[in-house]
């Protein structure tokens, strides 16, 4: 059976690869794909504390 | 809103088939991950497997490429093939779909597959 | 694979305690600074309910008395003041590597 991506990285992975514009990093496969590709969790409703830090997930600027 | 809904549960023999789907809508399937998860009586929770938005599946290796999971992107659909059916395959079948994280905030009802002869 | 074990098992509370449910795994779950580590409720004959993701981020629409914490291998789930609704089975699960795999469960009971 084919091992998903991830079984085959090390603990020390480096840093996500710059993905280009209009790309977002896809954290569960480790590759750069189209942002309309993924679903970001819900946002908070107004007020709620402490907004998700920038990830690597976020299209490069 | 996502909702998923599944079906194709019920009662089958010790080495039968079974295919369960999820129809899926507030969003298209296209897009994202899409997961069978179960759960035995009275037990906790195992995943199946996923597939992704481009079609990339993977499974949990316990289950020895007897599961099988696919998509008709046309009806917005995800499909579970079960083949070589045993007893500890009994379990309520969940469809979920994660965020960017794996964290999986939208699941069906689930649907019910019980093997006995 | 990656095992997450759960502890304890099953605890007794009191509507207003503090309860902690921590959740071990094997290996880190953490990459590119993220903890790839959730948390869950379930009610008996119902569906999980995403609680905590990216081991402390508050899910939208869950009570502030949900929290969570830790890093690497290490995680815990704190409910601040248990209320009657909240007695239920808690899963963590990591999706830092194939297959994602859940602990065993906490079952939390009314004392």
């Known amino acids: 059976m084919r091992r998903g991506p991830r079984s085959l990285r090390g603990r020390d992975a480096p840093a996500p690869t710059p993905c280009v514009p209009a790309e977002c990093f896809d954290l569960l496969v480790r590759h750069c794909v189209a942002c309309g590709l993924l679903r970001t969790p819900r946002p908070k409703p107004a007020g709620a504390s402490s907004p998700a830090p920038r990830t690597a997930l976020q299209p490069q600027e | 809103e996502v909702q998923l809904v599944e079906s194709g549960g019920g009662l089958v023999q010790p080495g039968g088939s079974l295919r369960l789907s999820c129809a899926a809508s507030?969003?298209?399937?296209?897009?994202?991950?899409w997961n069978w998860v179960r759960q035995a009586p009275g037990k906790g929770l195992e995943w199946v497997g996923y597939?992704?938005?481009?079609?990339?599946?993977y499974y949990n290796p316990s289950l020895k490429s007897r599961f099988t999971i696919s998509r008709d992107t046309s009806k917005n659909t995800l499909y579970l093939q079960m083949n070589s059916l045993r007893a500890e395959d009994t379990a309520v079948y969940y469809c979920?779909?994660?965020?960017?994280?794996?964290?999986?905030?939208?699941w069906g009802q689930g649907t019910l597959v019980t093997v006995s002869s | 694979d990656i095992q997450m074990t759960q502890s304890p098992s099953s605890l007794s509370a009191s509507v207003g305690d503090r309860v902690t449910i921590t959740c071990r795994a094997s290996?880190?779950?953490?990459?590119?600074?993220?903890?790839?580590m959730h948390w869950y409720q379930q009610k008996p004959g119902k569906a999980p309910k995403l609680l905590i993701y990216?081991?402390?981020d508050l899910e939208s629409g869950v009570p502030s008395r949900f929290s969570g914490s830790g890093s690497g291998t290490d995680f815990t789930l704190t409910i601040s003041s248990l209320q009657p609704e909240d007695f239920a089975t808690y899963y963590c699960?990591?999706?830092?590597?194939?297959?994602?795999?859940f602990g065993q469960g906490t079952k939390v009971e009314i004392k």
């Open positions: 290996e880190s779950v953490d990459d590119y600074g993220i903890s790839f």
């Open positions: 990216r081991a402390s």
């Open positions: 699960q990591q999706t830092s590597k194939d297959p994602w795999t």
């Open positions: 507030g969003d298209s399937i296209t897009r994202g991950y």
């Open positions: 979920a779909t994660p965020h960017t994280y794996g964290a999986m905030d939208y």
């Open positions: 597939i992704n938005y481009s079609g990339t599946t």
